[in-house]
């Protein structure tokens, strides 16, 4: 008996061939021996089976002795043995229809679990193997689960169902809802305008939800909510914003926040959360602000940074075009009795400058100038 695998929702064509290359009488029946379709001369006739409105044949092939049964919009319950009767012969074809669906939704939040469920006909014992967009293979039976979805899991999952040495392939598009970056850091000189951007790693037709930015300033004992906002069809509207600092927010995606000026008291880290409509859980992006200040007080030239810096970052003070006078893995450095000239305060990581602030030291009879 020939075995054919089909996919739920697809169309399958079961073949039936006569030795005579001409149009002769044929019938397709199901395992209950109820007629699905056949011919009466050149006319296609259909029986009362449940396939009645989804079954067809190709009349153009009848003259060549081919009498296919085409079943559209396949259902799991279409799995059956189909019998083609032609020239006093019976050809049997076993059709097995499978369906593969993702749990509840194909749009999942980062960190959530993806469960793929295989619908299969009674009596079948298929095996399933799925390959994620990043090339990870998972195997299973009726259900396959992937916990802790990552951004790289977004894309087309290819799943192969194996039954009776035959296979059928499913493609499922999974969208992992996440921000492009889990964390970002912004380095700014005191007084500069700060731009925070929170680009999403996915695009959807309509995006609705609400969000909030909580901020933990380095100098503060507790965190506070800086801004809350709503998102409706990709349009952003601010609900509530603190008076200090008075953040501004862009009206369109990507989510964009502007802090009028970087001040040491704002240095710290924030957590932007976005709750999407009809989704359980929230999207998170961490954002960090490091603020630098260079000052000269009497005979002391000081450079300080505030905010979450890594212990491997180097803070240096140097006179322009000269070697660093002082260089430490600390958050403050200073030079006593600095020479006159343009001094540079540098925050660097393995030689790469992350933040730079210049201060002009005038001869001792003058006051310093900050460009």
């Amino acid at each position: 008996k020939k075995v054919v695998l089909g996919k739920k929702g697809d169309t399958v064509e079961l073949t039936c061939t006569a030795s005579q290359k001409k149009s002769i009488q044929f019938h397709w029946k199901n395992s209950n021996q109820i007629k699905i379709l056949g011919n009466q001369g050149s006319f296609l006739t259909k029986g009362p089976s449940k396939l009645n409105d989804r079954a067809d044949s190709r009349r153009s092939l009848w003259d060549q002795g081919n009498f296919p049964l085409i079943i559209k919009n396949l259902k799991i319950e279409d799995s059956d043995t189909y019998i083609c009767e032609v020239e006093d012969q019976k050809e049997e074809v076993q059709l097995l229809v499978f369906g593969l669906t993702a749990n509840s939704d194909t749009h999942l939040l980062q960190g959530q679990s993806l469960t793929l469920t295989l619908e299969s006909p009674p009596g079948s014992s298929p095996s399933v193997q799925c390959r994620s967009p990043r090339g990870k293979n998972i195997q299973g039976g009726k259900t396959l689960s992937v916990s802790q979805l990552e951004l790289q899991d977004s894309g087309t999952w290819t799943c192969t169902v194996l039954q009776n040495q035959k296979k059928v392939e499913f493609k499922i598009d999974i969208v992992v809802l996440a921000f492009q970056k889990a964390s970002s850091i912004v380095y700014k000189k005191e007084g500069e305008q700060v731009e925070f951007s929170f680009p999403l790693a996915f695009t959807v037709e309509k995006l609705t939800g609400s969000g909030e930015l909580w901020w933990q300033a380095e100098r503060a004992s507790s965190s506070k909510s800086w801004i809350t906002f709503d998102l409706k069809n990709k349009e952003v509207s601010v609900k509530r914003v603190t008076q200090d600092p008075k953040l501004q927010m862009g009206k369109k995606l990507p989510l964009h926040l502007t802090l009028p000026q970087a001040l040491p008291q704002y240095a710290g880290s924030g957590n932007l959360t976005l709750a999407l409509e009809a989704k359980t859980g929230k999207l998170h992006q961490e954002v960090n602000l490091v603020v630098m200040r260079a000052t000269q007080l009497q005979k002391n030239l000081t450079c300080e940074v505030w905010g979450p810096t890594s212990p491997k970052l180097m803070l240096s003070l140097k006179l322009e075009n000269k070697e660093a006078k002082v260089s430490k893995r600390e958050k403050a450095v200073w030079v006593l009795n600095p020479e006159a000239g343009m001094w540079q305060c540098l925050l660097s990581d393995s030689g790469q400058v992350l933040l730079e602030s210049n201060i002009k030291v005038l001869p001792t009879w003058s006051t310093p100038v900050q460009p």
């Epitope: 019938h27 209950n32 021996q33 109820i34 007629k35 259909k46 029986g47 009362p48 449940k50 409105d53």
Partner: antibody
């Protein structure tokens, strides 16, 4: 066991629409085809058409232009609408369950029938 | 549509008589034929399917035969409770169609 009960007005005016409902009790409406059959007084049976719970319908070509069938799975009911009625549509209307089993296809459960008269 | 022609339209026989009803299809319907019994004021009841298979619980005095276009329904020994109208119905193709019926009475 499964029982069927037809309901609807017994009198319909010519050119109006005949509306009947069949309520399925004692079993699920799912997985089967449900049909309507009519029988004018002293005459034979005429299959009007059938519907399943997916809403898939097949109508008798002789009535197709006037027939609409629908299903309400939440109420375990299916309905028949026959438009532009004339006196020739006066009959006993039966609802029935269509069953397929080995070598058999036919109506295995019937309602008791409801008489519809078309008259002004 | 497949036309089903039943004959006779009515007959009268004595209790114990052998009663035969014929049904002719307008085209080949293989064995896809049912026979129903309908008593006055009641819904039809299935007696025979696939031309000759007796439905469970139906007395063995009822039988059916034939294939293709010509079919026969027989009551081997008519009983008083057999007074009814008998219908053939094809299920080879949609629409399902019935014969005109044969009314059986007792003399």
């Amino acid at each position: 066991q499964v029982q069927l009960q037809e309901s609807g007005p017994g009198l319909v005016k010519p050119s109006e629409t005949l509306s009947l409902t069949c309520t399925v009790s004692g079993g699920s409406i799912s997985t089967y085809y449900w049909s309507w059959i009519r029988q004018p007084a002293g005459k034979g049976l005429e299959w009007i058409g059938r519907i399943n719970t997916s809403g898939s319908t097949t109508y008798n070509p002789s009535l197709k232009s006037r027939v609409t069938m629908s299903v309400d799975t939440s109420k375990n009911q299916f309905s028949l609408k026959l438009s532009s009625v004339t006196a020739a549509d006066t009959a006993v209307y039966y609802c029935a369950r269509e069953l397929e089993r080995y070598y058999y296809y036919g109506m295995d459960v019937w309602g008791q029938g409801t008489t519809v008269t078309v008259s002004s | 549509d497949i036309q089903m022609t039943q004959s006779p339209s009515s007959l009268s026989a004595s209790v114990g008589d052998r009663v035969t009803i014929t049904c002719q299809a307008s085209q080949d319907i293989s064995n896809y034929l049912n026979w129903y019994q309908q008593k006055p004021g009641k819904a039809p009841k299935l007696l025979i399917y696939y031309a000759s298979i007796l439905e469970t619980g139906v007395p063995s005095r009822f039988s059916g035969s034939g294939s293709g276009t010509d079919f026969t329904f027989t009551i081997s020994s008519l009983q008083p409770e057999d007074i009814a109208t008998y219908y053939c119905q094809q299920y080879d193709s949609l629409p399902l169609t019935f014969g005109g019926g044969t009314k059986v009475e007792i003399k």
